[in-house]
Every structure is written in C-alpha cells, then in structure tokens.
C-alpha cells in the first residue's frame, strides 16, 4: 500500500455530503452504494460515517462531467470513472464521479419493476423467455404492448417478472396525476399513438391521460426507457425500437448481429435496412460501490496500490463479496489504527437543518430521472393490475400466474438462522431479526430469544428471554414487530403472516392478504405510528397507509419510501420508532429520521435523515 | 531515468501545418496525462493542449480547431498536429509528464518537461 | 479562467539572503498550486507541488506555503544557481494557467 505524503484526516467520525445524483440509479441505491462504501472501511479500521447535508461536510460527493469545477476534468464514457482528493480542507477529501459513465451494480442498468410478482425486484439482463436471450424489457408475449422483464435470468424456469417503467404505467409530472398515458389521444386536433415531444422544445416526451388534451389539458411526462437508450451509433440517446428489422429479419431485442467485436446494438427505427439508425446497447455499467469504496479510501488517505488484488489497485474490476485485500486493509490501518469500533463515536449531524438530498435542478414540468414513483394503483385507465391479465402471456407455454411467491432469500446483510445460545451477548448479534419499542422499553430480537433494553442507568440491558415464553404464538424468526401507542397492541410480522397480541391474548395468524396486501408483499419490514389511529406500513422499498382499527391498507396510498423518508436505505430490513424519531435499519446500521407527524401531505414534504450510526454501538450502548 | 524529446519544429509560412513529436521513455507512459506547453520568445509558459490515457483531448481556446493532439502508447510518442498556424502560434514548444495519474488528484505539478523544439511562423 | 498574479516582477537579492516570491490567485485553488524555476534556454524544472511539497531532489532551502489565494515560495539562502526565472501554476480550476513569472536576479 501507499499513503498520500501522510495525510489523513485528524479525527475518526468522518461525515459526507451526496451533493447530487446521477440518473443512472435510483436515488435511494445510490444512498446505500456509498453508505456500503464507507462501511467497507469502518469494518476494518475505527472510522464511522456520518450523512450530513450540507458543505460542511469531510467529504463532498458528486457527480459530473468533463470540466466539472475542479482542475480535473472528466474524459466522457470509460477511461478516468472517478477521482478524489486526499484528506483536507476544502475540496481536498471530496469524491467526483464520471456521469458519463454508466453506474451500476456491475451487471448492468438497473431497472426497477411493478406490480408482477417480483415485488419490485429489478430486471435481470440477459433473461431467457421462450428460449430466447433478452437484454432489455420486451413487449413480446403481450398484446397491450407494456414492456416487462424477468427479474431472474431465466423466465421460462421461474416465470418472475415485473412491469418496466413505461408509458403505460405511469407518467411523471405534469399535472395528470400520475396516470398512465392514454392512447390515441388527441392534441391540436391530431391524433397520436405514442409519447410525443410535439409542442415542446426540451425535447422531453410527454403524452396526455386522457384521451383528449385539446379539451381536458391533462398530461405527464413519459418515463424514460434507461434499458434501451442507445449510446454511440449515430442516435446517441434514443431509444431503441423493438422490433426492428435488420437483413431483412426481425429482432425483439438488442443484437451482435453484423458484428464481429460481439457488441450488441440496436435500431432506433422499426427498419434499420431502410433507416440505417442504430446505437449501442448499454453495457454493464461501472459498480458505483466498487469504484466508491475505491475513491472513498483515496478520500481517506490511501493511494495506490501496487496489488493486483488490492481495491486500491488503479484498475477497475468487477467483484462480489467483500472488496478490502490485506494490502488495503494494511494500508488503512496503518492511517488509522485497527479496529472496528467506533472511536470516538460517531459524531453530533450537522447543526443545519437537513436539506433535501438534492435542490432541483429544472422546472417542476420536467422529468428529472429515469427511475419515478410507483405506478398509479389500477383504475379505469387500464394500468395492469397484478392479477392473472398483468402477466407476459406467450400462450401454450405457460403465461406466469402471479401467486403466492417464496419470500426471498437472505442477502448477506440480512439476519442468519443459526441457533442463538441463551448465553450469547447481543453486542455479538450482527443483525437483528427485529427490533421495536414495546411498553416504554427497546426489544432486539433474533431467532426465537429477545432483549430489553431499558434507557437508564444501573443495568439497562435484560435478557434473553425466550420470545415464545412471553408470546407463544409467535415463530422463532421474526420480520417486525410494533406497538400501537393508543392501544398498546403489539403487532409482529413473519413473512406473510401477522399477529397481533392484547396482553396475553392473540389473534392471528392472519395472511397479509387480510391487510389487503397482494402476494409481492412477502414480508412488512416495520410500522410507524401516525396520530388518530394510522400507521406507516413498510416492505420493500413501499409504504403504506394502515389503519390499525380495522387493520387493512389503503392500497390508493402506496408509494416509494423515498419519496416521504429521504436518503434511507431502500432495503431497510427492519423500521421502528424510538423516542419519537424513526429507525431504519440495513445490515450493523440504522438511519434515524425525525420526521413530521404528518404524512402523504400534498405537498409530500419529505422527511430527512439526522444521524447515522451501528445498532449495537449506538442503541444498544455496547462498548 | 525518465526522458521526453521533442521534435519536429522548424520554420514554417502563416496558414502552413507542422507535426510535433514527443519520444518518452523511462516510466509508463500509457498511464500518464500528456501536455503540450508553450512559450513565446521572452515571454511567460502557456498550456496548448492534455490528452488522457483514455485518448481523451483538451485545448486551450488560442489553438482549438487548429490542433490536435495524439499518442500512440505503443510507440511511447506524444503528438501535436498543428494547422492553419499563426505568426503568435511562434513559441517553444514543451512536452511535459503530469506528476500524477489515474483518479488520486493530488499530486499536482509537471515532473518532466523535455528540451523543446522552437516552432516560427513567419512570411 | 483564473488570473495568477507574480510579484514582484523582478527581485534583486545577494547570495546568502533570504528571497520571497508571491504568487495570487483570482480565487480559491486550494493548494493546488505549483512553483517551476527556468534558466535561459532550458525547461521549466519543478521545485514545488501541492503549494508546499519539494520535488524529488529539490534541495531544503526552497519552501512552499500557502492555500486559497495566497501562495509563497521562500528560498532560504541564496545560492548562485538559483538565479533564474520562478513561475508559479494553478490546477484548482480549468483550465490550468501560469503566473507571468518573477525573476530573480543577482543584486
């Protein structure tokens, strides 16, 4: 390893600021690509990270292109991905980003899906359907014409699918209020069959939602297809047009036909032999982890390694797992001592208030990003609807029935099943299965056991005592857990299933179907109360409203959790209220939010994280 | 050791074209940004033009459209193209090496200059 | 672009004395400063990076300092090599741009 001529910063709780965001991503996995990032190094040496939301922080993060403010320009697509500076003042210790790049999770574009059955999984490119390779979303095996995708690699061996942004799911802005595009519509009197720029001079595509604009004014922006804009070519930036002809034979996704070099492509028209239109189809795109954790161990002292293996190598490849090799880990120790745990703790926020993770940059008309708010809940329009008809249907051979699916399996962030010894000290538990406030007092659980913690001194932690000792219904492995303030009714989710105790006496359990949740919902990552007897429901990703008198969903009130809880992780696999503020937890971490009481206001103000910081460290106290 | 040795510069008429050439040796030169620097007779050092490793191009405002610059890492060679040349285009010519290279931007200074070639423009 | 202002535009000093050069900046870049010394007919060699850090085998007496807008370069006793003409550049915006230079000549 090699260090910067010896810097490094002078103390350990080390703050950032996403300054802006590219629209490769969405924004809430862009959040939790750099909070990744950062925890690559606080796993191996005493440093924590702190979001804040303003300038003063340590490190500023940014994406840009070419001349972008600094002495370092940007060199378009590949070539230079990033560049940081060692640690100081000013821009020194700031981490830029190439947004001529495609970023990624390393495997290409990521496409968020709706409804389905895949409860918004992205797209996985290349997928199988019908034998046949996809590496962008296809109309093919429908009739209506909504784009779709697998989200496994092979749709003919496990029918997962979801919905692709698209026209006909949604609209973006303007003031149709997010429903979809209705075609044909009729604007100045013609009549158009697809998104249109007409009348505009941004360039952006835009369509009315109802079948005259003319005469109701009403319209929205169509969302923008990031599977298949083209690059390079000689239509940089449109769309690719499926099907399309090429030789005289039609193609229904991107190709490498005609070439030697293997690249796919696209035509941009329904005919290349007569068009000659065509781009590049987008590639894997760089690991915005990857390359962050790279640039954040510039940001923190760390210059190049000569280690082919090492993260700091000057090269980028793609790998999984975790990314440190001895040589990083050697070197950031060296800077800053070993060790994991926090020293000193993590830091006080910023005294500012929180600002939104990102001012807007135009007018409110324009779609700003490829990745919008979930699709309006089905009406009249025509949207799908996640029963049978929503489903690719090719036909004999097998259109996918949206049923009831397995909850996903465990990502390595999320809780193991191995047997708790009673014996075992929470500050060891590197995820819990669950944590809630339950009668004044913090309860973590984890495989069938569970601690109080109570918030004062003397010996503020008990346990563990045996769930099912204390509520005998329960399984050993929970998902979430909550107390209603009013009635002091503990709710517990485990997959599909609540229960829902009054004192000793349960009911339940009972299938989330009950709750008016359709079978993607495989599990309720947490509640928060909200007055007059309503509760934030959250799952992968969503939120709902929940009335917890009569205990069902309002299903017109789903929409994506950043859009009322800023900069958390879309993942959080457990939410809960602690001393009235909110808790999202994703892996060792939580993201605490102080948010208004309030909520799905018109003007949807959004609700911003203040702290970041470890379970065990921080709520748990553990030394 | 490291070496940069330009070449290539000579008289030439307003309006002509010359081809500058930079043979470097002695470090990696295909992960290194390239400058052309100038300086006029008895005057101060002016940046002309940088290409990336990526191949990537930046000029200053005096020569865009007129120059171009290139590498060929294989042959280790820095290139400036020079076009539709100006009598104030008359200057010594340097090579220089960044001091830094790839995404740590830190280390900022140039560590290698070569000896320079005069390029004149006169009638 | 940023305006790199040098003075003085001359400086006379004696071997053996103390010589600083000044180096302004239109605005902020940080310390993204670098300090070139040329003699008649030669290229431009680096002394200083990063507004305070020698070159490789820079002697001790040359010194840099500085951050923001205000850059020094201090050559703490005069040596008759160190006769020549200092340049100062910026990198903490695009484009790059030198200073029009001090010489320092012998009194």
């Known amino acids: 390893f090699q260090t910067f001529k010896g810097l490094k910063w002078d103390h350990h709780n080390i703050t950032y600021w996403i300054q802006n965001y590219s629209e490769d991503l969405p924004r809430d996995m862009i959040d939790d690509a750099f909070a990744r990032a950062f925890a690559v190094w606080g796993e191996v040496a005493p440093l924590t990270f702190t979001r804040v939301y303003g300038p003063e922080a340590d490190i500023v993060i940014q994406f840009g292109v070419a001349e972008h403010g600094d002495g370092y320009p940007f060199d378009g697509k590949d070539g230079l991905l990033a560049h940081a500076f060692p640690p100081g003042a000013g821009v020194q210790g700031d981490a830029h980003f190439d947004d001529d790049e495609l970023w990624s999770l390393g495997k290409g574009v990521v496409i968020p899906t709706y409804y389905g059955n895949s409860n918004g999984a992205p797209c996985h490119f290349p997928f199988t359907f019908e034998g046949r390779s996809y590496s962008a979303c296809t109309t093919d095996g429908r009739n209506d014409g909504t784009p779709w995708c697998s989200t496994t690699a092979d749709y003919d061996k496990d029918g997962k699918f979801g919905f692709c942004p698209s026209e006909r799911l949604y609209t973006e802005h303007g003031n149709g209020e997010g429903k979809p595009c209705v075609f044909p519509f009729i604007f100045e009197g013609r009549s158009y069959s697809a998104c249109t720029t007409k009348g505009r001079s941004d360039g952006y595509r835009w369509c009315a939602t109802t079948a005259n604009y003319d005469q109701d004014k009403l319209y929205g922006f169509c969302p923008t297809r990031v599977d298949a804009t083209v690059v390079g070519g000689n239509s940089a930036g449109e769309l690719c047009v499926f099907p399309f002809v090429f030789l005289g034979k039609q193609y229904s996704s991107c190709t490498s036909d005609g070439r030697r070099d293997g690249r796919l492509w696209c035509a941009t028209t329904s005919n290349f032999d007569t068009d000659k239109k065509w781009g590049f189809c987008p590639d894997q795109g760089y690991s915005l982890f990857l390359v962050a954790a790279h640039e954040f161990g510039h940001a923190l002292g760390l210059d190049h390694s000569s280690v082919p293996e090492a993260l700091m190598y000057p090269l980028y490849s793609y790998l999984e797992g975790f990314p440190l090799n001895k040589d990083d880990i050697d070197g950031i120790q060296y800077l800053y001592g070993r060790g994991s745990k926090p020293d000193p703790r993590p830091p006080a926020t910023t005294t500012t208030e929180p600002q939104p993770t990102a001012p807007p940059t135009m007018c409110p008309t324009i779609p700003p990003t490829a990745y919008p708010t979930v699709g309006p809940t089905v009406g009249p329009t025509g949207a799908p609807s996640p029963g049978p008809t929503s489903s690719p249907s090719p036909g004999p051979t097998g259109a996918p029935s949206p049923g009831p699916t397995a909850p996903p399996t465990a990502g390595s962030s999320e809780a193991s099943t191995e047997s708790l010894s009673p014996a075992d000290n929470p500050c060891n538990v590197d995820v819990f299965d669950a944590i809630a406030e339950i009668q004044g007092a913090l309860h973590f659980f984890k495989d069938g056991w569970y601690w109080k913690f109570l918030n004062h001194r003397g010996s503020p932690l008990q346990g563990p005592f045996l769930t099912a000792r204390t509520w005998p219904a329960l399984p050993a492995t929970l998902d979430s857990a909550f107390e209603d303030p009013q009635t002091k009714r503990v709710f517990f989710f485990s997959g599909r299933q609540m229960w829902v105790y009054t004192g000793k006496t349960v009911l339940g359990p009972r299938s989330l179907d009950k709750l008016g949740l359709g079978p993607e919902v495989t599990h309720v990552s947490g509640l928060l109360p909200r007055r007059l007897g309503k509760a934030l429901l959250f799952s992968k990703g969503r939120v709902w409203r929940f009335d917890l008198k009569s205990q069902k969903v309002d299903p017109q009130s789903v929409i994506r959790v950043d859009k009322e809880f800023s900069g958390v992780p879309w993942n959080s696999h457990d939410i809960f209220q602690y001393q009235d503020k909110a808790y999202f937890c994703h892996g060792k971490f939580f993201w605490r939010v102080s948010f208004q009481n309030e909520v799905n206001k018109v003007d949807h103000e959004v609700n911003q994280v203040d702290d970041v910081g470890y379970v065990t460290y921080d709520l748990l106290q553990c030394p | 050791e490291v070496q940069l040795l330009e070449s290539g510069g000579g008289l030439v008429q307003p309006g002509g074209s010359l081809r500058l050439s930079c043979a470097a040796s002695?470090?990696?030169?295909?992960?290194?940004d390239m400058w052309w620097v100038r300086q006029a007779p008895g005057k101060g050092l002016e940046w002309v033009s940088?290409?990336?490793?990526?191949?990537?191009?930046f000029y200053a405002d005096s020569v865009k459209g007129r120059f171009t610059i290139s590498r060929d890492n294989s042959k280790n060679t820095l290139y400036l193209q020079m076009n539709s040349l100006r009598a104030e285009d008359t200057a010594v010519y340097y090579c220089?090496?960044?001091?830094?290279?790839?995404?740590?931007?830190?280390?900022?200074?140039?560590?290698?200059w070569g000896q320079g070639t005069l390029v004149t423009v006169s009638s | 672009d940023i305006q790199m202002t040098q003075s003085p535009a001359t400086l006379s000093l004696s071997p053996g004395e103390r010589a600083t050069l000044s180096c302004r900046a239109s605005q902020s870049i940080s310390s993204f400063l670098a300090w070139y010394q040329q003699k008649p007919g030669q290229a431009p060699r680096l002394l200083i990076y990063?507004?305070?850090y020698r070159a490789t085998g820079i002697p001790a007496r040359f010194s840099g300092s500085g951050s923001g807008t205000d850059f020094t370069l201090t050559i703490s006793s005069l040596e008759p090599e160190d006769y020549a003409v200092y340049y100062c550049?910026?990198?903490?915006?695009?484009?790059?741009?030198f200073g029009q230079g001090t010489r320092l000549e012998i009194k």
């Open positions: 002695g470090f990696t030169f295909s992960q290194y």
């Open positions: 220089a090496k960044d001091r830094a290279y790839g995404d740590y931007v830190g280390w900022n200074g140039f560590d290698y």
């Open positions: 990063d507004a305070s």
């Open positions: 940088v290409i990336y490793p990526s191949g990537t191009t």
């Open positions: 550049q910026q990198r903490g915006n695009w484009p790059i741009t």
